[in-house]
Each structure stands twice: as C-alpha cells, then as structure tokens.
C-alpha cells in the first residue's frame, strides 16, 4: 500500500480513537508504526516524494505527541493534531491531482 494511503487512513483512524474515544494508547499504536516507516526512509520515488512533501510536518507533529508523553499537557497533543489534520488535508487534495 502506498505511503499516502497508509497515512491517510491511519490518521483518520487515530483521530477517531483520540477525539472520539479519548483512547490515547490506541492512537499511539496506530501512529507509531507509521512514523517508524517514515523514519526508515523512502525506498521508491513515490515514497521519496511523500517524504519530501510531508516528512518535516509529520516529524514535527510526532515531536509534539512525544512531548505529551512526558508533559501530560493535552495542549501538546492538540498541537500535534493540528499538524496531522493539516497534512491529512494536503494528502486528500494532492491525491486527486495525481490520480
């Protein structure tokens, strides 16, 4: 499955777990493998393109979410989700232009 599809569905599912169920553990269980995949680095041209387009913002969001783990300040997680949604929007719109 293409990276943009995995992130698209993963972010939606994680958002429902967090905002709908307040299930932070479940949210991290979805996000952590996606970030690990990104951290391993791209192996195809499409993955390289994805990494260039969204890598910096996704890493920033991840840093805010990791900060929450030590701070327990909900605002840190909200900052992460602002960025995640921003990326989700871009993926939704970008996908249309290339398919």
């Amino acid at each position: 499955i293409l990276w943009h599809e995995q992130w698209h569905e993963g972010l939606e599912e994680a958002s429902r777990l967090y905002f709908g169920d307040r299930n932070v553990k479940g949210m991290f269980e979805i996000l952590e493998p996606l970030h690990a995949m990104l951290e391993r680095g791209p192996q195809t041209l499409k993955e390289t393109s994805f990494s260039q387009a969204y890598g910096r913002e996704l890493t920033e969001a991840y840093e805010w979410s990791q900060r929450y783990k030590t701070s327990a300040v909900v605002m840190d997680l909200d900052r992460a989700w602002d960025i995640y949604y921003h990326v989700f929007q871009k993926i939704s719109r970008h996908h249309h232009h290339h398919h």
Epitope: L11, S15, R16, F19, G20, Y85, H95
Partner: antibody
Amino acid sequence: EVQLVESGGGLVQPGGSLRLSCAASGFNVYSSSIHWVRQAPGKGLEWVASIYSYSSSTSYADSVKGRFTISADTSKNTAYLQMNSLRAEDTAVYYCARFDWYQRYSFYEAMDYWGQGTLVTVSS
Amino acid sequence: DIQMTQSPSSLSASVGDRVTITCRASQSVSSAVAWYQQKPGKAPKLLIYSASSLYSGVPSRFSGSRSGTDFTLTISSLQPEDFATYYCQQSYFYPVTFGQGTKVEIK
C-alpha cells in the same frame, strides 16, 4: 450560533462574472473547511470547490477549474467564490457549507452547517 | 474521480415502513461517507457522517452502515416529516462527490 449567509447571486449574461460571498458567524473560517455546492433547477447536488485557510489549500471540480476561484478573508470571517466565464450550465442555487473537524471527531468531511443558498442565473 | 452510484432514484413508501437507500462507491472510500436529507427549497441537512455516526439532533430511526464499498442509509420507521430527497457524499479523496439522490415519496 453557527450561521452561513450567502449573497451575490443574480442574473448574468454568458461569459460574465459574479462574486459570491459566504459570511460566517459562530465559528472561525480559518480553522474550518468551507465548501461551495451547487444545485441546478430540478437536479441533484454538485460539489464545486473548497478552501482550508489554515494551509491555504483549495480544490475545484473539473467543471469549474480555471474559471472559478475560491478564497477567504479570515479577518472578515467570509469566504468567496469568484465566478468568471459563466455558462448557461452554471445556472444553479449555490450553497456554502462548512466542515469543522474539531466538532465531528473525524477527518472525513461532512458538511454540518449550510447557508440558505443564492441563485445564479446565466442567460442572455 | 470517485463515483457514487445511488439507488433507487425514487421510492414510494408509507408511514411506518422501513426504508433502505444504497450508495456504491466506484473504489474504496474507507468510511468517508455522509448522508443528507433535503426538502424542496431548503438547504441539505446532515444526517450521518463517517458512514455510521449519527449527527447530533438527528432521530435514532436514521442509521448508516458500510459493507466494503456499499453504504446504506436506513430509516427504521418512516415518519411524515421524512418524505424528502436523500443524498450520499464521499470525501475520501478530492473531488468530493455526491450520489444522484433518492426521492422518498408518499405511497
């Protein structure tokens, strides 16, 4: 209370231009997606365009791409649809609607508030 | 673009009937489907979002479900105020697309 009020519709000749406005209250246009959806007389709903001001993202239906421009003035909490090179087939009631993911707990866009609509008639 | 094929285009039913409207997506759209009700001369109203979540204030007789790329809106017991046109909409990827609509009329 959330409200969307469209204005700017009217009668215009083919090839002409109109600018529709969507004045929002009760929420922040900056952090919401604003959509324009139209409905030709006796027909179904057709999505036209949307804007997400937070990231300056815009998208258009193929039928209006290159002719219509969606924008927002966050200081006025208002979205706009600039319509150029209008055609008879653009005749419709134009609705603006919003999606605010903070309200829905879902990223998938469902339009929870709609304006009353403004009629655009393209005819000579 | 993702096509949403809605059926039937119209149906006649009586008060108290169970009514089912279906939308089929031309490709996977996950659960990114919403349902709207529209009455003549009025703006659409949101009923269901994310395929099966009931929007606040909407009566519980309305429900939504998903099976793969097939999405269903069910009205368990049709009420007089439910006679209207219903639309499905996908927002998985842009452009957003609507179904053609289903007009629910009084038998």
